[in-house]
Interface confidence: low
């Protein structure tokens, strides 16, 4: 629908208190490194904007896009050269071509200071002397390191922040209500924001037919009941919301996921028989609780597949007649029947249907042609599923410290070119899979695994996207977004790759180390660990593990020392002396 | 490819009735959209109803009370019941179908509302 004044529109459907919020978080989105006061100074000009357009929707202005309106106010900045650089460009541009440049400005590790968590009390003081200016602060810090979270999701995250520093603020033990709680929070937002980073990697890299693909197969595994025109129009609804927060457009984003919270409680009945309790909610929990749910049984009488896609007479007269939609129908069918696969492998599976029929349909006799279709399927569904069973069995062998380990080392033969904290991140991530997933029975194992590896490895794609330095990654990321995970899988030994100088430097250890917590502690053991593989990439699993032992010992002893830097000093150079010797370095 | 056909439009009185039906031909699943605009000469198009997978209805103001929309999904048809026409109804009136495939336009058919 058309409405005289957009800015008017959506302040009245979101309200003034999201609407503020949405706009903070589009801004600190776009201009990462601005400080929170001129944010919140824009946020409310815009707001006191939005009012005026309310009181009268034909006031000067009103009628502007919001790209054009936003855009205009964060070209206002004045450091905007200073702070930015080229992204100052940008201002120079009309829209929309103004909000791309933006867009293609987000920088998914921004150069900015960890966030370091102060005492309770001085939080819950900060909390109780101004909650407004407290809760946006979190919105701001989040949105700036996180360019691409999704924003009604973020407003659930603020929710539960303030909920608790309510409830933990007034307890007698504040640090022991707050702090799981907040670390409850910050590990589900990393999750949360890892998984939308994916959805609008495959939207902006691979296009809406991908998206809407991965959403037909999810939707259709979720609500194995619902017909396929209510899967279809979930998915285009679904579809439009993501591409409208990962375009930029929070305030249309989080009216219209809205608007489908709506439309799927109001059909229920037609859709899962799983949401009556998210659809008793309020509407962020409700919205998060129905991106959650679980999946609804499946329909008890589903007639086999070969019917329909391999001996009907008329499976190429359908194909060439609406080939999307008879794809999106296989997908439909095959995911409903499957929700013990993961969307990935669903996927590879309807792009091995489409390759056949495409193949098939132009050749002599096509039933002839594609008469054993499925049997291509079945060493694609062994092949996660033999991964799977072997990883699993590694994590329960290891333990997850020490698997991701085996990981940090797996991924750094094959690309050695990546930056070690990258390495680091992403391998501790992909070592995550198994205190996740492999709990699982079977049914559940591989949907778990190989669509969270999916999620990691697009937070490694993104970060190199930023600084390429392997074409192996490159190829990997950009070939095939459902393929990326077997891609990385079957990356063997770099040889190519040129061992790395030695540098004691980076073997040099110092009584901080003592101080940290286990969680750091690891960290900085891991990134030695990837250290001493960029200089030796031949080196054998004993070695290695020989060597993370005699380090593992050095940093204990020294940490119960009396004199622990001159621990430190000295039986760190013994350490790398023996270190070099065991490896031959 | 699927194709969409208007049929019903024509001359008629103010305060005169005409049903406007549309069919999809070629195989076309999971509608879950079907809708009729119109364009008035020199204006934009503008929806004037429209049902979805659900079955509710959605109306242009101008319209409520007098038009009445309805589909057959077994036939992949969906008709327009229009009565009280009006001066102001005349214009190509155009049916739209969407699914998951993509959204799907009929050529027009031209309704006067003309004494």
């Known amino acids: 629908d058309a409405h005289k004044s957009e800015v008017a529109h959506r302040f009245k459907d979101l309200g003034e208190e999201n609407f503020k919020a949405l706009v903070l978080i589009a801004f600190a989105q776009y201009l990462q490194q601005c400080p929170f006061e001129d944010h919140v100074k824009l946020v409310n000009e815009v707001t006191e904007f939005a009012k005026t357009c309310v009181a009268d929707e034909s006031a000067e202005n009103c009628d502007k896009s919001l790209h054009t309106l936003f855009g205009d106010k964060l070209c206002t900045v004045a450091t905007l050269r200073e702070t930015y650089g080229e992204m100052a460009d940008c201002c120079a541009k009309q829209e929309p071509e103004r909000n791309e440049c933006f867009l293609q400005h987000k920088d998914d590790n921004p150069n900015l200071p960890r966030l370091v968590r102060p005492e309770v009390d001085v939080m819950c003081t900060a909390f109780h002397d101004n909650e407004e200016t407290f809760l946006k602060k979190y919105l701001y810090e989040i949105a700036r390191r996180h360019p691409y979270f999704y924003a009604p999701e973020l407003l659930f995250f603020a929710k539960r922040y303030k909920a608790a520093f309510t409830e933990c603020c007034q307890a007698a033990d504040k640090a022991a209500c707050l702090l799981p709680k907040l670390d409850e929070l910050r590990d589900e937002g990393k999750a949360s924001s890892a998984k939308q980073r994916l959805k609008c990697a495959s939207l902006q890299k691979f296009g809406e037919r991908a998206f809407k693909a991965w959403a037909v197969a999810r939707l259709s595994q979720r609500f194995p009941k619902a017909e396929f025109a209510e899967v279809s129009k979930l998915v285009t609804d679904l579809t439009k919301v993501h591409t409208e927060c990962c375009h930029g457009d929070l305030l249309e984003c989080a009216d219209d996921r809205a608007d489908l919270a709506k439309y799927i409680c109001e059909n229920q009945d037609s859709i899962s028989s799983k949401l009556k309790e998210c659809c008793e909610k309020p509407l962020l929990e409700k919205s998060h609780c129905i991106a959650e749910v679980e999946n609804d049984e499946m329909p008890a009488d589903l007639p086999s597949l070969a019917a329909d896609f391999v001996e009907s007479k008329d499976v190429c007269k359908n194909y060439a007649e609406a080939k999307d939609v008879f794809l999106g129908m296989f997908l439909y069918e095959y995911a409903r029947r499957h929700p013990d696969y993961s969307v990935v492998l669903l996927l590879r599976l309807a792009k091995t249907y489409e390759t056949t029929l495409e193949k098939c349909c132009a050749a002599a006799d096509p039933h002839e042609c594609y008469a054993k279709v499925f049997d291509e399927f079945k060493p694609l569904v062994e092949e996660p599923q033999n991964l799977i069973k072997q990883n699993c069995e590694l994590f329960e062998q290891l333990g997850e410290y020490k698997f991701q380990n085996a990981l940090l080392v797996r991924y750094t033969k094959k690309v050695p070119q990546v930056s070690t904290p990258t390495l680091v991140e992403v391998s501790r991530n992909l070592g995550k899979v198994g205190s996740k997933c492999c709990k699982h029975p079977e049914a559940k194992r591989m949907p778990c695994a190989e669509d969270y590896l999916s999620v990691v490895l697009n937070q490694l794609c993104v970060l190199h996207e930023k600084t390429p330095v392997s074409d192996r990654v490159t190829k990997c990321c950009t070939e095939s977004l459902v393929n990326r995970r077997p891609c990385f899988s079957a990356l063997e030994v770099d040889e190519t790759y040129v061992p790395k100088e030695f540098n004691a430097e980076t073997f040099t250890f110092h009584a901080d180390i003592c101080t940290l917590s286990e969680k750091e502690r690891q960290i900085k053991k891991q990134t030695a660990l990837v250290e001493l593989v960029k200089h030796k990439p031949k080196a054998t699993k004993e070695q290695l593990k020989a060597v993370m032992d005699d380090f593992a010992a050095f940093v204990e002893k020294c940490c119960k020392a009396d004199d622990k830097e001159t621990c430190f000093a000295e039986e760190g150079k013994k350490l790398v002396a023996a270190s070099q010797a065991a490896l031959g370095l | 490819q699927v194709q969409l056909q208007e049929s019903g439009g024509g001359l008629v009185q103010p305060g005169g009735s005409l049903r406007l039906s549309c069919v999809a031909s070629g195989s076309i699943w999971g509608i879950y959209h079907m809708g009729w605009y119109r364009q008035a000469p020199g204006k934009q198009r503008e929806l004037v109803a429209s049902?979805?997978?659900?079955?509710?209805?959605h109306y242009a103001d101008t319209v409520k009370g007098r038009f009445t929309i309805s589909k057959d999904n077994a036939a992949n048809m969906v008709y327009l019941q229009m009565n009280a026409l009006e001066p102001e109804d005349t214009a190509v009136y155009y049916c739209d179908i969407r699914n998951v495939g993509g959204d799907y336009w009929g050529q027009g058919t031209q309704v006067t509302v003309s004494s």
């Open positions: 049902i979805t997978v659900d079955g509710s209805t």
